[in-house]
């Protein structure tokens, strides 16, 4: 048996940061389970992972490069992405499993979500008449 | 090349309070999440604290909380350990460790500083 | 919190010989398991990441297998500068954890 993941197909980072929410088919209140972010189509890069245990706040561990945080509500995980690069732009697996009680059980591959992080622009000053010259 | 050195060792009576320093080289220290593993003399590796680039997330084992901080200077490369109430069972040598390319594995590790509790 | 259990504690062996040594978790820990070398006096190294990963600059012939709760590390034909103590680590669940280690010894 294996959970489904629901997850936006496409999300904008303009301000260099962006939320990603994990909406899974299974109720997480009261279990020990592990929730983790991945980068690149092969998923090969573990971006972040949130701990959740019943007995204890949320435990969120950030990969080299990556600032992030994370939400739990009882059918999702709210991915916090920060100070993201251009060059992160890419597409993003949500993955969840249910460490404990047993059975162990974790997700069917999502569709992902391409996180487009736009460049941080200057804003070009506004236009208006200088001093005259002469 | 990478190194990580730690520092403020020593012996302290039970109760007691002891600092301990790593000093980072080779590597952007702001970007990496640092963590300190001790060691009972004769025993196993024992994770103790933890600590995210910017301080936002601190975790500690449950054998030190309210007891241990950590910290991180990153302007000065440097993690630290603030031991309180020390006890007994504190007795190890203290490993400063670097998070892994994989979340929550640790490499490298540095040379270890002994931290004795006793009377 | 999970429980890691090495076998056998102490391991003698000649060069040359191939190593075989077991961690078993408390429960699943999916593949999330590393294992370290740590030699007399040394801090402890990164061998392998999750269950199965050679971490940068690690020879051949060091080999991880296994998942869930059953996992093998494997030196295929021991060199002298392999005896050491070796330790499992998960990070499967909170909080990460240590096995107490298997003593590879020159028989």
């Known amino acids: 048996n294996k959970i489904l993941v629901k997850q936006s197909p496409m999300l904008v980072a303009y301000d260099n940061a962006v939320n990603l929410s994990c909406k899974y088919s299974y109720n997480l209140f009261s279990r020990e389970f592990r929730a983790s972010l991945h980068k690149g189509l092969d998923s090969a890069v573990e971006v972040c992972v949130v701990y959740g245990n019943y007995s204890q706040q949320l435990q969120v561990y950030s990969k080299t490069g990556f600032n992030c945080d994370g939400k739990l509500g009882n059918e999702s995980v709210t991915f916090y992405l920060q100070n993201l690069y251009v060059n992160q732009t890419d597409i993003y697996f949500c993955k969840i499993e249910v460490m404990y009680p047993p059975p162990y059980l974790d997700n069917e591959k999502s569709n992902g979500t391409i996180i487009h992080v736009k460049g941080k622009h200057l804003c070009p000053s506004p236009l208006f008449p200088g001093p005259s010259k002469p | 090349e990478v190194q990580l050195v730690e520092s403020g060792g020593g012996l302290v009576k039970p109760g007691g309070s002891l600092r301990l320093s790593c000093a980072a080289s080779?590597?952007?220290?702001?970007?990496?999440?640092m963590n300190w593993v001790r060691q009972a003399p004769g025993k196993g590796l024992e994770w103790v604290s933890s600590i995210s680039t910017s301080s936002s997330h601190i975790y500690y084992a449950d054998s030190v909380k309210g007891r241990f901080t950590i910290s991180r200077d990153n302007a000065k490369n440097s993690l630290y350990l603030q031991m309180n109430s020390l006890r007994a069972d504190d007795t190890a040598v203290y490993y400063c460790a670097r998070e892994g390319n994989i979340v929550l594995t640790f490499d490298p590790w540095g040379q270890g500083t002994l931290v004795t509790v006793s009377s | 919190e999970i429980v890691l259990t090495q076998s056998p504690a102490t391991l003698s062996l000649s060069p040359g010989e191939r190593a075989t040594l077991s961690c078993r978790a408390s429960q699943s820990v999916s593949s999330y398991l590393a294992w370290y070398q740590q030699k007399p006096g040394q801090a402890p190294r990164l061998l392998i990441y999750?269950?199965?990963n050679r971490a940068t600059g690690i020879p051949a012939r060091f080999s991880g297998s296994g998942s869930g709760t059953d996992f093998t590390l494997t030196i295929s034909s021991l060199e002298p500068e392999d005896f050491a103590v070796y330790y499992c680590?998960?990070?499967?669940?909170?909080?990460?954890?240590f096995g107490q280690g298997t003593k590879v010894e020159i028989k």
């Open positions: 999750d269950a199965s």
């Open positions: 680590q998960q990070r499967g669940y909170w909080p990460p954890t």
């Open positions: 080779g590597f952007t220290f702001s970007t990496y999440t």
